[in-house]
């Protein structure tokens, strides 16, 4: 959402979010690190190209032309400088002058040593309990953002991990149309469209960076869960990793896992949709998880097959019209899991990413809540690894990522909601090792061809 320094009456009224880096002679004297040449305060560039007609409520949602409903000026950073005040480095760079290349390795969670596994679990738990040092979240829409008295910004502190959950919630929430009117649900700024992979890539990159800074460990990396096992068991659901099943309630996590103590945020959907409020930092009930336990839907009781990944990587077009969850021969729609692994759309199909979520059968299978289950992180790092392999194989061919007429939020140059500073889908449509400072340690299955006798 927004930096704490910008959650003020002055910043919101002026529309300027250009915090100082190292002000020597009073506030406003080093906006965006301008005195050291790191950046400058400039007008926000927001995509104004048309979106698909599926969203008919232009003017009613704060997420339109993001982030202009809140701010129209932000920091534009030079070279490898980055961040809300140009005080950090672009992904893949570090050092005081952001001139040292960095490459971290994301590895299979199951391949980590016992100490590394423990380190990761403890780091997640620390992120759940550590207030985000930079960002605060809005608890009201823009028209109510200054409170009933017009002078009290409606923002709250939130933990690093809950911020990760909140940003996802905010991207998928319904459009509030007013008290007494039904909220509009055919909108999603991070799923069912071309931005699915780029949005989730930045989402993970932000969490990884936040955790690196929390730990002051630049080499910290998020592992992945290779969910394409074809099994009907969750191999990472053990107490030393993501938590086994509770013996007392099959939908809960074992009390021997730290994750049994976690409480979810953003669960009061009815309030948000009827009152027009936003999810806040209040934690509610426990994580629910019942892997392979949805007996009513046998098709989601088994994880994707290894060959499903090999097949989806042969779909050579990134996306295809209508750039939605019914696209055929679209790599994005295939890995997202609305098409079968060969790329053929079938309304009954749930494969790959979607199937992995639904397999978890609980918190992790509900879109507005899913990141509350930390398996989300591992599921999406694997999805991102598949994306990165596609980018490598097909030379990051962006030609079929639409510039316009995608679902709202999904045009190529749209600023991904609700990230700050503004970041477009294009910026994430690049090979990670060369451009984003991370790589995956992974072996991809090759397609098995049957030779006719």
């Amino acid at each position: 959402q927004f930096p704490r320094q910008c959650a003020t009456v002055e910043a919101l009224r002026s529309g300027m979010c250009c915090p100082d880096l190292s002000p020597v002679s009073g506030p406003g004297t080093d906006r965006c690190g301008s005195s050291s040449g790191r950046g400058r305060c400039e007008a926000v560039t927001a995509d104004s190209r048309p979106h698909s007609p599926q969203y008919p409520h232009d003017g009613r949602d704060d997420r339109e032309v993001w982030p202009l409903r809140f701010f129209n000026r932000t920091c534009h950073c030079n070279g490898n400088f980055s961040g809300h005040n140009c005080g950090t480095c672009r992904p893949g760079w570090r050092g005081a002058a952001c001139d040292q290349r960095v490459l971290i390795v994301r590895r299979n969670l199951l391949d980590l040593s016992k100490e590394e596994k423990n380190h990761f679990v403890r780091a997640l738990d620390m992120a759940k309990r550590t207030t985000h040092p930079l960002f605060v979240i809005a608890t009201r829409r823009s028209e109510e953002i200054l409170g009933p008295d017009g002078n009290t910004p409606q923002f709250e502190n939130i933990s690093i991990y809950n911020y990760f959950v909140w940003t996802h919630y905010y991207s998928v929430k319904k459009t509030f149309l007013g008290v007494g009117q039904e909220s509009f649900g055919e909108v999603d700024f991070s799923h069912e469209g071309p931005a699915f992979l780029t949005w989730h890539r930045y989402h993970l990159l932000r969490l990884e960076k936040d955790m690196q800074e929390m730990l002051q460990e630049p080499s910290f990396s998020l592992p992945y869960w290779n969910f394409a096992t074809g099994k009907n068991v969750c191999d990472i659901c053990t107490d030393d990793l993501m938590g086994s099943r509770s013996n007392f309630d099959s939908t809960l996590i074992s009390p021997n896992s730290v994750f049994s103590q976690w409480r979810v945020v953003c669960d009061s959907l009815e309030d948000y949709d009827t009152l027009g409020t936003l999810c806040n930092s209040t934690e509610d009930g426990p994580i629910r998880r019942n892997p392979a336990g949805n007996v009513a839907r046998p098709m989601v009781q088994r994880l994707p097959e290894p060959q499903d990944v090999a097949q989806c990587l042969e779909v050579g077009l990134f996306d295809t019209p209508p750039f939605y969850s019914n696209s055929t021969n679209s790599f994005r729609n295939t890995v997202e899991g609305y098409s079968d692994p060969t790329g053929k759309y079938d309304p009954a199909v749930r494969s790959l990413h979607n199937l992995a979520h639904l397999f978890l059968n609980g918190t992790g299978g509900q879109t507005h809540l899913s990141p509350n289950d930390p398996i989300f992180v591992l599921l999406h790092t694997f999805t991102d690894a598949v994306f990165d392999e596609w980018l490598r194989r097909y030379n990051a061919d962006i030609s079929t990522f639409p510039l316009e007429n995608a679902p709202i939020g999904h045009n190529r140059q749209y600023n991904m909601v609700p990230f700050w500073p503004p970041v477009t889908n294009t910026e994430m449509f690049v090979t990670a090792p060369d451009n984003l400072g991370y790589t995956y340690e992974i072996q991809w299955p090759s397609r098995e061809f049957s030779v006719p006798e």
Epitope: S113, E115, N118, A123, P133, M214, Q216, P218
Partner: antibody, heavy 119, light 107 residues
């Protein structure tokens, strides 16, 4: 070059408090976590915990919660260790050491501050 | 909590001889192990990190090996300045544990 200069030796009575300083130079103070290590006379090294110099968030090792407080002042690139309700068993040399490399090891150390607790 | 046990407690050797010091972890620490040297009245000095990498400025006579639970530091030919106390150290969840130390003394 990286340097860590700690405050001088202290002689304190049981029940008193002490605040040790560790001034860093030669690097960006807020870029690297600061660790504190204790060494009782003739004994080995014992990790006390660390402070995130970017956020001020402390992490304490078992046995070092309650009477021990890590703090810092970024304007003077200095980390502090305060010990209250001193006991005889707190007599030790206290070292500060930034986690300067990305590998989590301690490649630079302060010279140490001897705290003696005696009535 | 991971416990590091060093052996021997004391090692008496002469200059020019080869020294081998051991460190055993109560459970696997992968290769997250370091060795430090401490001389009387001085702060510890990093010698080896990640089990086998020499820190900047450390002479080639120092070498480290091992992974998992068993680690060794070897000094191929002892110099007079090498007689000191040696500690192994592992990182676990941002907190360190050290071995109890091995004193390397002149025979």
């Amino acid at each position: 070059q990286v340097q860590l200069v700690q405050s001088g030796s202290e002689l304190k009575k049981p029940g008193a408090s002490v605040k040790i300083s560790c001034k860093a130079s030669g690097y960006t103070f807020t870029s690297y976590a600061m660790n504190w290590v204790r060494q009782a006379p003739g004994q080995g090294l014992e990790s006390m915990g660390w402070i995130n110099t970017n956020t001020g968030n402390p992490t304490y090792a078992q046995g070092f919660t309650g009477r021990f407080v890590f703090s810092m002042d970024t304007s003077v690139s200095t980390a502090y260790l305060q010990i209250s309700s001193l006991k005889a068993e707190d007599t030790a040399i206290y070292y500060c050491a930034p986690r300067y490399s990305s590998s989590w090891y301690l490649d630079y150390w302060g010279q140490g501050t001897l705290v003696t607790v005696s009535s | 909590e991971i416990v590091l046990t060093q052996s021997p407690a004391t090692l008496s050797l002469s200059p020019g001889e080869r020294a081998t010091l051991s460190c055993r972890a109560s459970q696997s620490v992968s290769s997250y192990l370091a060795w430090y040297q401490q001389k009387p009245g001085q702060a510890p000095r990093l010698l080896i990190y990640d089990a086998s990498n020499r820190a900047t400025g450390i002479p080639a006579r120092f070498s480290g090996s091992g992974s998992g639970t068993d680690f060794t530091i070897t000094i191929s030919s002892l110099e007079p300045e090498d007689f000191a106390v040696y500690y192994c150290q592992q990182r676990s969840n941002w907190l360190y544990t050290f071995g109890q130390g091995t004193k390397l003394e002149i025979k």
